[in-house]
Amino acid sequence: CPTSCKCSASRIWCSDPSPGIVAFPRLEPNSVDPENITEIFIANQKRLEIINEDDVEAYVGLRNLTIVDSGLKFVAHKAFLKNSNLQHINFTRNKLTSLSRKHFRHLDLSELILVGNPFTCSCDIMWIKTLQEAKSSPDTQDLYCLNESSKNIPLANLQIPNCGLPSANLAAPNLTVEEGKSITLSCSVAGDPVPNMYWDVGNLVSKHMNETSHTQGSLRITNISSDDSGKQISCVAENLVGEDQDSVNLTVHFAPTITFLESPTSDHHWCIPFTVKGNPKPALQWFYNGAILNESKYICTKIHVTNHTEYHGCLQLDNPTHMNNGDYTLIAKNEYGKDEKQISAHFMGWPGIDDGANPNYPDVIYEDYGTAANDIGDTTNRSNEIPSTDVTDKTGREH
């Protein structure tokens, strides 16, 4: 632990002015693991003037950083690049004349305290005023800056010509597109100071290329993947003062695929579990031993979870018998195509031949988490009746 500091497994605090520290505290290689440090408290360190780019990067778990009543004059732009957990920064009563929003733009700070610094009135610190105005909390800080006449003026009154928030405007066609097709988005940005423009495509899977020239830009997305349905694409304008974004949601239409279909499992009901992907929502149809399966309150499709264009559900069977053993085929269909998969189901042996049920499925009714109503397609057809499951419904449940 550096001289003038104390260290624990999760904290470093340096408050002794003598001899004091001249650089940001660093831990010895074989001491505490810097990743476990969550709080650094520095006070009364008049000779600490700079935070360099690599000073803080080892403290990846850092949540609270306090440097008060010290000599801090300069913070490198990328000083906090690796500190994504930072939530509270307190730089009260230092010697900061300027501070860029670039230091903090990637952080989700709940507190940034900058009181008592000799800021110079310029467009560089206008973002702090904007931040203060956006925070409608009553505990706004009393911040000042020095103007050309060396007069202290409240930041709340600061007016700088040609220094405002930018704007972004995304011109998008109807963003419903078929899988495999391509699309181009256009965006224009405006503002003074002139903003930079960039695209935020999140975790877009599809191949994309962007072209930007000053205040105009385009994004070309090619061979669009079904995995990108529901994703948001944003055009962002950013300058010294702040940023603005305009966003659109991508909808991708694609043929269904049955990504999962397995043999029955038993809980509160027997369930043949499946997962189907498709957009628009596929219609589902079950076949039993090659014939259309007529659903009833004893055999029916239930969707448990819908996640974007993915549907997780069950063909639910109440008290099936040997009469329900056989091949079950699921067909999923929409206007872009269809998919089918088949499984063999064995619920119990024929009476007198194979007495026991499958030992993996004990012969009891298990409590389950319930089922949601089926919201995919119409699966009822009255032809080719197949054996219903036990219509006496021994458990007396309502359906």
């Epitope: 990504t259 999962f260 397995e262 499992t265 038993s266 809980d267 369930c271 579990p273 997962t275 448990h304 979870v305 819908t306 996640n307 974007h308 993915e310 997780h312 993996n360 499925y361 004990p362 009891v364 298990y366 389950d368 988490y369 949601a372």
Partner: antibody, heavy 122, light 107 residues
């Protein structure tokens, strides 16, 4: 009846190791995703990680993945949590919980064990 | 990681009243959210999954709503046994995360 019974908890020294077990019965264990969740005394729930039905995919909460290992033995219907390099903040009640039979890990937990207490103290 | 912010941390109410608990996700999670009840000294019990679907055997006075980033959980006509702790949990992506919990206390 679906039953999950954890065991193996107890007092362990800081820096030490411990292996927890969860014995499952009343359902086809080999079909389900399984998770471990812990709860420090008087605190909230924290998901530790999950394992898929055949044990080929294991997901952990990032801060714990270097010290905890989840495994399963489908022949014994048992889920395991190997804990190493434990610290006082690992003191908690450790639950195993049953996930889903779907092909993806839709992890809501319909069934929980009663928990086993791990106390880390010198 | 997706942060789940649950509020309030504690709430007092009287028998027969209604209460609402809110859960905010730090990013959109669709409807992949569950609610649990935990009684002192007991394991959590699933009440609601997929944001709105009541788990089997759960009384209809419990109700879940919401999608995207904002979710609500309402208990109507509070009974004595409802004055315990409640947690939300996202199962949109790993690591699955829980809200900090809400303790319901009797007025």
């Amino acid at each position: 009846e679906v039953k999950l019974v954890e065991s193996g908890g107890g007092l362990v020294q800081p820096g030490g190791s411990l292996k927890l077990s969860c014995a499952a019965s009343g359902f086809d264990f080999s079909r389900y995703w399984m998770s471990w969740v812990r709860q420090a005394p008087g605190k909230g729930l924290e998901w530790i990680g999950e394992i898929n039905p055949d044990g080929s995919t294991i997901n952990y909460t990032p801060s714990l993945k270097d010290k905890f290992i989840i495994s399963r033995d489908n022949a014994k219907n048992t889920l395991y949590l190997q804990m190493s390099k434990v610290r006082s903040e690992d003191t908690a009640l450790y639950y195993c919980a049953r996930g889903n039979y779907y092909g993806s890990s839709l992890a809501w937990f319909a069934y929980w064990g009663q928990g086993t207490l791990v106390t880390v103290s010198a | 990681d997706i942060q789940m912010t649950q509020s309030p941390a504690s709430q007092s109410a009287s028998l027969g009243e209604s209460v609402t608990i809110t859960c905010l996700a730090s990013q959109t999670i669709g409807t992949l959210l569950a609610w649990y009840q935990q009684k002192p000294g007991k394991s959590p019990q699933l009440l609601i999954y997929a944001a709105t679907t009541l788990a089997d055997g759960v009384p209809s006075r419990f109700r879940g709503s919401g999608s995207g980033t904002k979710f609500s959980f309402k208990i109507s006509s509070l009974q004595a046994e409802d004055f315990v702790s409640y947690y939300c949990q996202q199962f949109y992506s790993t690591p699955y995360t829980f809200g900090g919990g809400t303790k319901l206390e009797i007025k």
